[in-house]
């Protein structure tokens, strides 16, 4: 089995607890992989304001994960 690594995770630190819904352009979920041993929720902000990592344990992240999974499966 490949060793799980933290070194290539996209998120640095634990992530913010919430992002204003009005500021969200899109949400991406990165599932644990060879590169990173944790789930990452990355929010792309509107108006070219970049991206933010959302704390995957936060209420907002859990809602987004649920919504995305419902859409995909």
């Amino acid at each position: 089995f490949p060793m799980f690594k933290r070194g290539r995770c996209l998120c640095i630190g634990p992530g913010v607890k919430a992002v204003k819904v009005a500021d969200i352009e899109k949400a991406s979920i990165m599932y644990p992989s060879n590169n990173c041993d944790k789930i990452e929720v990355i929010i792309t902000l509107k108006e070219n304001k970049g991206q933010r990592c959302l704390n995957p344990k936060s209420k907002q992240a859990r809602l987004i994960i649920k919504k995305v999974e419902r859409k995909n499966f």
Partner: nanobody, 129 residues
């Protein structure tokens, strides 16, 4: 939200040293990604240095090429303070220096000012030649 207050700026001769401090209050400091940026009139904020929590009670750091080997970023979690030790200062280091904090920084955008949520008011550093 974290409140940040910088101090330690001033006037120094080329070749001299300064240590900037950034005192944080109102949030979890340990896991904050702490960045230093600088700005000169009419220009965008320029990345200087960043230090982030690796999740293993240790920190990693990254520096702009222009300051590598001269500047060192560090922190004292007990004091909720980040530092920027600046040695061998050059005339071109003259700028207003800002510290920034973020919990949700994406690695790809670590050098981008828009990645940080909270900012200090800035401290002026002037290097005379």
């Amino acid at each position: 939200e974290v409140q940040l207050v910088e101090s330690g700026g001033g006037l120094v001769q080329a070749g001299g040293s300064l240590r900037l401090s950034c005192a944080a209050s109102g949030g979890t400091f340990t896991k904050q990604t702490m960045g230093w940026f600088r700005q000169t009139p009419g220009k965008d904020r320029e990345f200087v240095a960043v230090q982030w929590w690796t999740g293993l009670s240790t920190y990693s750091a990254e520096y702009a090429d222009s300051v590598k080997g001269r500047f060192t970023i560090s922190r004292d979690n007990a004091k909720n303070t980040a530092y920027l030790q600046m040695n061998s200062l050059k005339f071109e280091d003259t700028a207003v220096y800002y510290c920034a904090a973020g919990l949700g920084v994406v690695r790809t955008f670590i050098r981008r000012a828009s990645s940080y949520d909270d900012w200090g008011q800035g401290t002026q550093v002037t290097v005379s030649s």
